[in-house]
Interface confidence: medium
């Protein structure tokens, strides 16, 4: 069973990701991952997805984020084309249409990618083995 | 319950130097990162500076970047905030808050004015 091209693209990104460490890293986002244990594998992609949306979509043009150098906009812009590329993949391999987003736990983005990293790598050692 | 108490405010002439200090209670500090923003008179709320739940890094607005400096003491609960240089646009209400994004918890603020 081979493992899917848009994991391979999805790890690859998040490696990228984690690799910055930012202010707009810091900054909170819902911890789908607190209590995930009733919930599918694309569940928990499709809620992800709607996680990154929501951070990019509230902070794309966030002043915080955006900094007054050219270095710091070009960072956040790369920041923001990366997550807009994990969000796109994420609903690639969810295959849903939507998802509720509930929980009052909160994380910053970082380990939110952190998770998330974790967890599609542990879903690439299964399928490669 | 999350309670956040600002001190150290009060009024400095231009050039002059305080040390803003937040003492925080009901959650276990040292597992989250620490941010102080503040208000200026008739104006909206601005970020002023962050620091991660570790202290390994930390980050400042332009307006305060090599002026003002974040720490923390973890043993302490502890959140400080040392102001030099201060000019009379640094006049505000600063206040600590838990984590950065939503900012859910605050504390009641704490006067810093800057005149001659």
């Known amino acids: 069973h081979k493992c899917d091209i848009t994991l391979q693209e999805i790890i690859k990104t998040l490696n990228s990701l984690t690799e910055q460490k930012t202010l707009c890293t810091e900054l909170t986002v819902t911890d789908i991952f607190a209590a995930s244990k009733n919930t599918t594998e694309k569940e928990t992609f499709c809620r992800a997805a709607t996680v990154l949306r929501q951070f990019y979509s509230h902070h794309e043009k966030d002043t915080r984020c955006l900094g007054a150098t050219a270095q710091q906009f070009h960072r956040h812009k790369q920041l923001i084309r990366f997550l807009k590329r994990l969000d796109r993949n994420l609903w690639g391999l969810a295959g849903l249409n939507s998802c509720p987003v509930k929980e009052a736990n909160q994380s910053t983005l970082e380990n939110f990618l952190e998770r998330l990293k974790t967890i599609m790598r542990e879903k690439y050692s299964k399928c490669s083995s | 319950e999350v309670q956040l108490l600002e001190s150290g405010g009060g009024l400095v002439q231009p050039g002059g130097s305080l040390r803003l200090s937040c003492a925080a209670s009901?959650?276990?500090?040292?597992?989250?990162?620490m941010a102080w923003a503040r208000q200026a008179p008739g104006k909206g709320l601005e970020w002023v500076s962050y620091?991660?739940?570790?202290?390994?890094?930390?980050y400042y607005a332009d307006s305060v970047k090599g002026r003002f400096t974040i720490s923390r003491d973890n043993s302490k609960n502890t959140l400080y905030l040392q102001m030099n240089s201060l000019r009379a646009e640094d006049t505000a209400v600063y206040y600590c808050?838990?984590?950065?994004?939503?900012?859910?918890?605050w504390g009641q603020g704490t006067l810093v004015t800057v005149s001659s």
């Open positions: 009901g959650f276990t500090f040292e597992e989250y990162g």
């Open positions: 620091i991660v739940a570790d202290g390994a890094r930390t």
């Open positions: 808050a838990k984590s950065l994004g939503r900012f859910d918890y």
